[in-house]
């Protein structure tokens, strides 16, 4: 039997201080550039080496950013989301969703990472 892949989803508040070269990451997503089908959310696509996000260490490529300084990122055009980050100020608070892949046991077996039941 094949194993099953589940995802452990957690949320975290990350406070970044803008560095000399900015926050140091790229994003994909938005209502006009969906990264995930039927999801116009904003996702971290690149953490730049030695940037503020990389030095902090908590933000990861693949994370979904839910809000910036308390402002929801739902239903935004891609460029509007980019502008929001660029105008977010020196101290930037990010609410992020981490999605950790969990390899469970064979199908039919409820592994430790399975939240059901």
């Amino acid at each position: 039997m094949n194993g099953r892949v589940d995802y452990l989803v957690t949320e975290e508040e990350i406070n970044l201080t803008r560095g000399p070269s900015g926050l140091g990451f790229n994003i994909v997503g938005g209502t006009d550039q969906q990264y995930v089908s039927n999801d116009s959310g904003i996702y971290v696509s690149r953490i730049k080496e030695n940037g503020a996000a990389a030095l902090d260490g908590r933000l990861q490529e693949g994370d979904k950013i839910l809000s910036v300084n308390g402002q929801d990122l739902k239903n935004l055009l891609h460029q509007d989301a980019v502008d929001l980050f660029r105008n977010a100020g020196y101290a930037v608070s990010l609410r992020v969703q981490h999605r950790l892949q969990v390899q469970n046991g064979p199908i039919g077996h409820r592994g430790e990472g399975d939240p059901s039941g």
């Epitope: 070269s21 900015g22 926050l23 140091g24 990451f25 790229n26 994003i27 994909v28 997503g29 990264y35 996702y43 971290v44 696509s45 690149r46 953490i47 730049k48 080496e49 490529e61 693949g62 891609h78 460029q79 980019v82 980050f85 660029r86």
Partner: nanobody
Amino acid sequence: DVQLVESGGGLVQAGDSLRLSCAASGRPFNMYDMGWFRQALGKEREFVATVSWTGSSTNYADSVKGRFTISRDNAKNTVYLEMNSLKPEDTAVYYCAARGGGTSVDSDYDVGEFEYDYWGQGTQVTVS
């Protein structure tokens, strides 16, 4: 991190074809711009081709235009380099590379040709 493993290299005759593959693992593949580079013995590494994270944009070095084709299969987490009409000067170690696509939240700037975050170990292509 992203792990990249190249395969498909080998020894071929001039005029032959070869298809290189690069399998990626470790992160969501479909958000990465992917590139192929090569390095001949005693020479510097050079750009060959890139494909954007959406797959909608490709770019090629002048030396391979019309002969090489880069493509990606996001379902298989794999990027390919189809090489036709191979020449002895195509002999090199071919490297696959990845970097997150999308837009910088900091500023609009042109990403450097070699500014990739993850690199494979390479596969040897020899054209006799």
